[in-house]
């Protein structure tokens, strides 16, 4: 759920979701239209597509809870629990080191970014 | 080779508190990715899954019975332990103890090994 | 929590015959799971992630589907396949079995 993703995105950027991610760009935070603006947004397009996917097979993704282990740098998600928690995992896990790879091109002046202003085609899944 | 053996009090009163063990060999509670469930049946009927217990002693319960459940372990002994509060005759069926399939495969991927079974009967 | 259906619940079977037993869920799953169960004895694993043997089932069972709708079939009933046969899935928590099909031989 929201709670997982937001605790695996600050251990593995070491930033604070809330403030640097959740909204930033045309994607990352809820919702998300138009073309992604960096690298960054990209991640969180890919997230939206990865959920999106999640929920056609039927999974709660923002109230499902997984497990996993966070060490020297790497998230392992545990082999607990049922089939939508570890792929839930996955998306999440996916998300946080997309983010940490793109640490270098992140640009402040797209958090909080107008959403109106986000145009052209979103990209499909 | 993996054995599981459950073993409970036959039969007790409504009201009362049942308290089940799961003895087991072939394994151990200890090792990283396992665990142990609670399955029954009601004579005649289907089965439903009750509890599960991991290794780190990270514990799941079936929401719509929750409340009365309480599932532990004892490692060293090889035992896992499930007890039921506040039954009635509803609760009377054959209780198991489950084990998932070796690694690589998941909890999501059902019950490879299973007890023989022991049958509760509880009376009014 | 997801509900799964059988069908038929109880159903016989010449020696020979094709057999197929239907388990629907209340939402879409992404496996399922298949056990056998004779009288008296505890279930055993028959099928792993839909389509799978577990190990000892003789090959002419065969499982199959996708989504909310799957089954299980004998592609020629034999005397030894008269038993209960229960779906499980664990897509979402809580894992949850069908009610269960009784195969009798005629």
């Known amino acids: 759920g929201i709670l997982n993703l937001n605790k695996m995105v600050k251990q593995v950027t070491g930033k604070m979701p809330i403030l640097s991610y959740w909204p930033y760009g045309c994607h990352c935070g809820l919702g998300g239209r138009g073309q992604p603006k960096d690298a960054t947004d990209w991640c969180c397009q890919t997230h939206d597509c990865c959920y999106d996917h999640l929920k056609t097979q039927g999974c709660s993704i923002y109230k499902d809870y997984y497990r996993y282990n966070f060490s020297q740098g790497n998230i392992h998600c545990s082999d607990k629990g049922s089939w939508c928690e570890q792929q839930l995992c996955a998306c999440d896990k996916e998300v946080a080191f997309c983010l940490k790879r793109n640490l270098d091109t992140y640009q402040k002046r797209l958090r909080f970014y107008w959403r109106p202003h986000c145009r052209g085609q979103t990209p499909g899944c | 080779q993996v054995t599981l053996k459950e073993s409970g009090p036959g039969i007790l009163q409504s009201s009362q508190t049942l308290s089940l063990t799961c003895s087991f060999s072939g394994f151990s509670l200890s090792t990283s990715g396992m665990g142990v469930s609670w399955i029954r049946q009601p004579s005649g009927k289907g089965l439903e899954w009750l509890a599960h217990i991991y290794w780190d002693d990270d514990k799941r319960y079936n929401p719509s019975l929750k409340s009365r459940l309480t599932i532990s372990k004892d490692t060293s002994r090889n035992q896992v332990f499930l007890n039921i509060t506040s039954v009635d005759t509803a609760d009377t069926a054959t209780y198991y103890c489950a084990r998932r399939p070796e690694a690589p495969y998941y909890d999501y991927d059902g019950f490879a090994y299973w007890g023989q079974g022991t049958l509760v009967t509880v009376s009014a | 929590q997801i509900v799964l259906t059988q069908s038929p619940a109880i159903m016989s079977a010449s020696p020979g015959e094709k057999v197929t037993i239907s388990c629907s869920a209340s939402s879409s799953v992404s496996y399922m799971y298949w056990y056998q169960q004779k009288p008296g004895s505890s279930p055993k694993p028959w099928i792993y992630?839909?389509?799978n043997l577990a190990s000892g089932v003789p090959a002419r069972f065969s499982g199959s589907g996708s989504g909310t709708s799957y089954s299980l079939t004998i592609s020629s009933m034999e005397a030894e396949d008269a038993a209960t046969y229960y779906c499980q899935q664990y897509h979402t928590y809580p894992p949850t079995f069908g009610g269960g099909t009784k195969l009798e031989i005629k």
């Open positions: 992630r839909t389509s």
